[in-house]
Interface confidence: low
C-alpha cells in the first residue's frame, strides 16, 4: 500500500515566491520619469521575474523631519495621484502581483520615525493602515524599526489591524539590526510578522559561517515563516563581491521562507560602478542609455536588455530560480536539513513528502573544492542518493540535466549547484 500523503500546509501568497522592492520610483524608472503611471508600464517586466509581490515606496507626502507636514494618506504629487495608484493596483492584480506599501513615515528625514512625538506618529500609521487596506493594498512595510520606541507593541497593534482586515494581508518590518537576540525579541510578540534585517549581511566570508547563521536563525525561529535578504532595503552588491551574487541568489531562493530582493538585484546592479549614483538607490539599468552621465560607463551586459538576451546571465539565473521556487513543492514549503560537506561549503536538502527533492551545495571559497557530503548528518526521511540530476549551476559549462555522482562532487570557486533527485520509499 502506498504511504499516505502528507497534508499540505496552508500557503499564503507571500509563501509562494519572491518579493521585489522598489524603494525609489525615480531611480527604478530613470530618465526623469519615476511616477506611478510609469511603473504600471514595468509590470510586465516584474511578471517576467515571477515575483509575487511588489514592495513599493514610500510614496506618501513627507517634508523632511516635519511631523505636521507628513501625511501617510496622501501620495506625494511627484509620484502621481491616488487615481494613478488605484490604476496600478488594478493592473498589478490582473498580473497576480500583490502590492505592499511602505509607510515608513519620515523617509526623507534623518530619523525615519522622527525623534519625538512617537504616539502621534503611531496614530498616523494606524489611520494609514486602515485607509490603504480599504484602498486595496495587499500589505505594508515599515523600516528602521530600531528607531521606533516600543516597536514590538506598535507592530503587534499594526499586525492586528492588518490581519483583522484579512488573513491574506502582510506586514513587513525592516531593521538594520544584525543581532539575532534583537531580531527574536521583535518576532516574539508578532506571530505572522515578516522581518527583513541585516542578519545575513556579514555572511559572505565562509560557507561554515553562513551555515551557522542560517541554521541558528531557523532553529531559533522554529516553525515560523521567515524571510531571507541581506538587508531591509539595500542592494546585494552593497554587501557582496560580484563573484558571490549568483551563489546568494541560489541560496536566497532555496532557503525555507520568502526571498526578498531590491530592484536591480536580478542584474547585479552596483552603485559603485555608476559614478555619482547614490549607494541606496542607483538608477536601474534598463539599457545602455539608462546612465548617460558618463558615456561608455555602462556596457550591455550590465543591463536588463543585454542580460535578457544572454541565457548565462545573472538575470536569466534569477528568472530560472524564481520559476523553480514558485512551482516545486519541496522549495515552496519543504523541510530543510543542513549537513556537512567540507570546509568552505554550505549544503542542504529541501524535501516534501513524496515530491521531488532538492540538494543545494554552495562553495563560498575562492578555490575549487571536492564536496564530502556527510549523509550521516541527515535524518532517515532525508537520505541522500548516490546520484542526483544537475538542475542548474551558477557557473557556465556544466551539462545541466545530467546525473552527478554525489561522492565525487567537485565545485568550482564560488560555484553553487542545485541538484534534484526523486523520493525513494
Amino acid at each position: 500500500r502506498a504511504p499516505r500523503c502528507r497534508e499540505l500546509p496552508a500557503q499564503k501568497w507571500w509563501h509562494t515566491g519572491a518579493l521585489y522592492r522598489i524603494g525609489d520610483l525615480q531611480a527604478f524608472q530613470g530618465h526623469g520619469a519615476g511616477n506611478l503611471a510609469g511603473l504600471k508600464g514595468r509590470l510586465d517586466y516584474l511578471s517576467s521575474l515571477k515575483v509575487k509581490g511588489l514592495v513599493l515606496g514610500p510614496i506618501h507626502k513627507n517634508q523632511k523631519d516635519d511631523v505636521a507636514q507628513t501625511d501617510l494618506l496622501q501620495i506625494d504629487p511627484n509620484f502621481g495621484s491616488k487615481e494613478d495608484f488605484d490604476s496600478l493596483l488594478q493592473s498589478a492584480k490582473k498580473k497576480s502581483i500583490r502590492v505592499i506599501l511602505d509607510l515608513t513615515p519620515n523617509y526623507r528625514g534623518e530619523n525615519s520615525w522622527f525623534s519625538t512625538q512617537v504616539d502621534t506618529v503611531a496614530t498616523k500609521v494606524k489611520d494609514a493602515l486602515e485607509f490603504w487596506l480599504q484602498a486595496g493594498v495587499d500589505g505594508f512595510q515599515v523600516r528602521d524599526i530600531e528607531n521606533l520606541k516600543d516597536a514590538s507593541s506598535f507592530l503587534a497593534e499594526w499586525q492586528n489591524i492588518t490581519k483583522g482586515f484579512s488573513e491574506d494581508r502582510l506586514l513587513i518590518a525592516g531593521t538594520n539590526s544584525s543581532d539575532l537576540q534583537q531580531i527574536l525579541s521583535l518576532l516574539e510578540s508578532n506571530k505572522d510578522l515578516l522581518l527583513t534585517s541585516s542578519y545575513l549581511s556579514d555572511s559572505g566570508s565562509t560557507g561554515e559561517h553562513t551555515k551557522s547563521l542560517v541554521t541558528q536563525y531557523l532553529n531559533a525561529t522554529g516553525n515560523r515563516w521567515c524571510s531571507w535578504s541581506l538587508s531591509q532595503a539595500r542592494l546585494l552588491t552593497s554587501f557582496l563581491p560580484a563573484q558571490l551574487l549568483r551563489l546568494y541568489q541560489l541560496m536566497l531562493f532555496t532557503l525555507p521562507g520568502t526571498p526578498v530582493f531590491s530592484y536591480g538585484d536580478e542584474i547585479g546592479l552596483d552603485a559603485a560602478a555608476l559614478p555619482g549614483q547614490p549607494m541606496e538607490a542607483p538608477v536601474m539599468l534598463w539599457d545602455e542609455s539608462s546612465f548617460p552621465d558618463i558615456p561608455g560607463a555602462v556596457s550591455a551586459n550590465m543591463t536588463v536588455k543585454g542580460q535578457s538576451e544572454d541565457p548565462g546571465s545573472l538575470l536569466s539565473l534569477f528568472r530560472r530560480l524564481s520559476d523553480q521556487r514558485s512551482k516545486e513543492r519541496s522549495l515552496l514549503h519543504g523541510d530543510f536539513h543542513a549537513f556537512s560537506a567540507g570546509p568552505g561549503l554550505f549544503s542542504y536538502i529541501r524535501h516534501w513528502d513524496q515530491n521531488e527533492r532538492f540538494l543545494v551545495v554552495l562553495n563560498f571559497g575562492d578555490v575549487g573544492l571536492s564536496a564530502g557530503l556527510q549523509a550521516s548528518d541527515l535524518p532517515a526521511s532525508a537520505s541522500l542518493p548516490a546520484k542526483a540530476d544537475l538542475l542548474l549551476s551558477t557557473q557556465p559549462g556544466r551539462e545541466e540535466g545530467s546525473p552527478l555522482e554525489l561522492e565525487r562532487l567537485k565545485l568550482e570557486p564560488h560555484e553553487g549547484l542545485l541538484l534534484r533527485f526523486p523520493y525513494a520509499a
Epitope: W113, S115, S177
Partner: antibody, heavy 126, light 107 residues
Framework: EVQLLQSGAELVKPGASVKLSCTAS????????IHWVMQRPEQGLEWIGR????????KYDPKFQGKATITADTSSNTAYLQLSSLTSEDTAVYYC???????????????????WGHGTSVTVSS | DIVMTQSHKFMSTSLGDRVSITCKAS??????VAWYQQKPGQSPKLLIY???YRYTGVPDRFTGSGSGTDFTFTISSVQAEDLAVYYC?????????FGGGTKLEIK
C-alpha cells in the same frame, strides 16, 4: 538639563564586589538606555553593556558576562553596575552614559552616547 | 564582535593645520559610527554620530565621513583646545566597540 550623577570613588579588596550607581536628572531613564563603559588607567574605552530600564533587558559584551551585572531602579531613576570577584585588572574608571535622544532613545544602532557621567574610579588593592 | 581599528595611536599636528584620523571596521557597519573626544581627567564627549552628523553644539571644524568599513574624522583647522584623544565607536551592533584611540599632539 540632562545629567548623569555617579557615585563616589571606591577602594576595594581583591575578591570583593562593588556596586556603582548612576542617577539621571533632567530625563526619565524609562525613555532611554543606560550604557556602562570602562576605562583602565592610560587605556582606551571598553563597552561593558547596556540596560533598557523600561523592561530590564540587558546586553553585555561577552567578555564582561559573569563579571558585570547591570540593573535599574526606575522609581529612583537610577542604574547600577555591580562588579564581582574583583582583581587588579578591574581597576578602572567606570562611566555610565546614555544615547543623546531621550524621547525615542531605542536607536541602538544609530546614535552615539551623548550624555556621560563624570565616572567612578574603582581601585582594587589589598 | 566588530573590531574597530584606529591605525595611529598618536598624531602630531600644528595649530591651524587640517588633520584626519581614520578608523576601519572589521565588517560593514553602514554609517553607524560615532567619534568622541576625551581630554585628560574628563569624560568622553560625543562629537559625531552616524558617521557624519555633528552632535549639538559641536563646532563645524569637526566633520566625519565614510560608510561600510572605512571612516574618517577631520578637524579642518586644529585649535589648542582640540588636543585630546579621539575614539571611533560602532553603534551598529551589540556589543558596541571602540577603536583604540588616537592622541592628537602638537609638533
Amino acid at each position: 538639563e540632562v545629567q548623569l550623577l555617579q557615585s563616589g570613588a571606591e577602594l576595594v579588596k581583591p575578591g570583593a564586589s562593588v556596586k556603582l550607581s548612576c542617577t539621571a536628572s533632567g530625563f526619565n531613564i524609562l525613555d532611554t538606555y543606560i550604557h556602562w563603559v570602562m576605562q583602565r588607567p592610560e587605556q582606551g574605552l571598553e563597552w561593558i553593556g547596556r540596560i533598557d530600564p523600561a523592561n530590564g533587558h540587558v546586553k553585555y559584551d561577552p567578555k564582561f558576562q559573569g563579571k558585570a551585572t547591570i540593573t535599574a531602579d526606575t522609581s529612583s531613576n537610577t542604574a547600577y553596575l555591580q562588579l564581582s570577584s574583583l582583581t587588579s585588572e578591574d581597576t578602572a574608571v567606570y562611566y555610565c552614559a546614555s544615547p543623546f535622544t531621550t524621547v525615542v532613545a531605542t536607536n541602538i544602532y544609530y546614535y552615539g552616547l551623548g550624555y556621560w557621567g563624570h565616572g567612578t574610579s574603582v581601585t582594587v588593592s589589598s | 564582535d566588530i573590531v574597530m581599528t584606529q591605525s595611529h595611536k598618536f598624531m602630531s599636528t600644528s595649530l591651524g593645520d587640517r588633520v584626519s584620523i581614520t578608523c576601519k571596521a572589521s565588517q560593514g557597519v553602514f554609517t553607524a559610527v560615532a567619534w568622541y573626544q576625551q581630554k585628560p581627567g574628563q569624560s568622553p564627549k560625543l562629537l559625531i554620530y552616524s558617521a557624519s552628523y555633528r552632535y549639538t553644539g559641536v563646532p563645524d571644524r569637526f566633520t566625519g565621513s565614510g560608510s561600510g568599513t572605512d571612516f574618517t574624522f577631520t578637524i579642518s583647522s586644529v585649535q589648542a583646545e582640540d588636543l585630546a584623544v579621539y575614539y571611533c565607536q560602532q553603534h551598529y551592533s551589540t556589543p558596541w566597540t571602540f577603536g583604540g584611540g588616537t592622541k592628537l599632539e602638537i609638533k
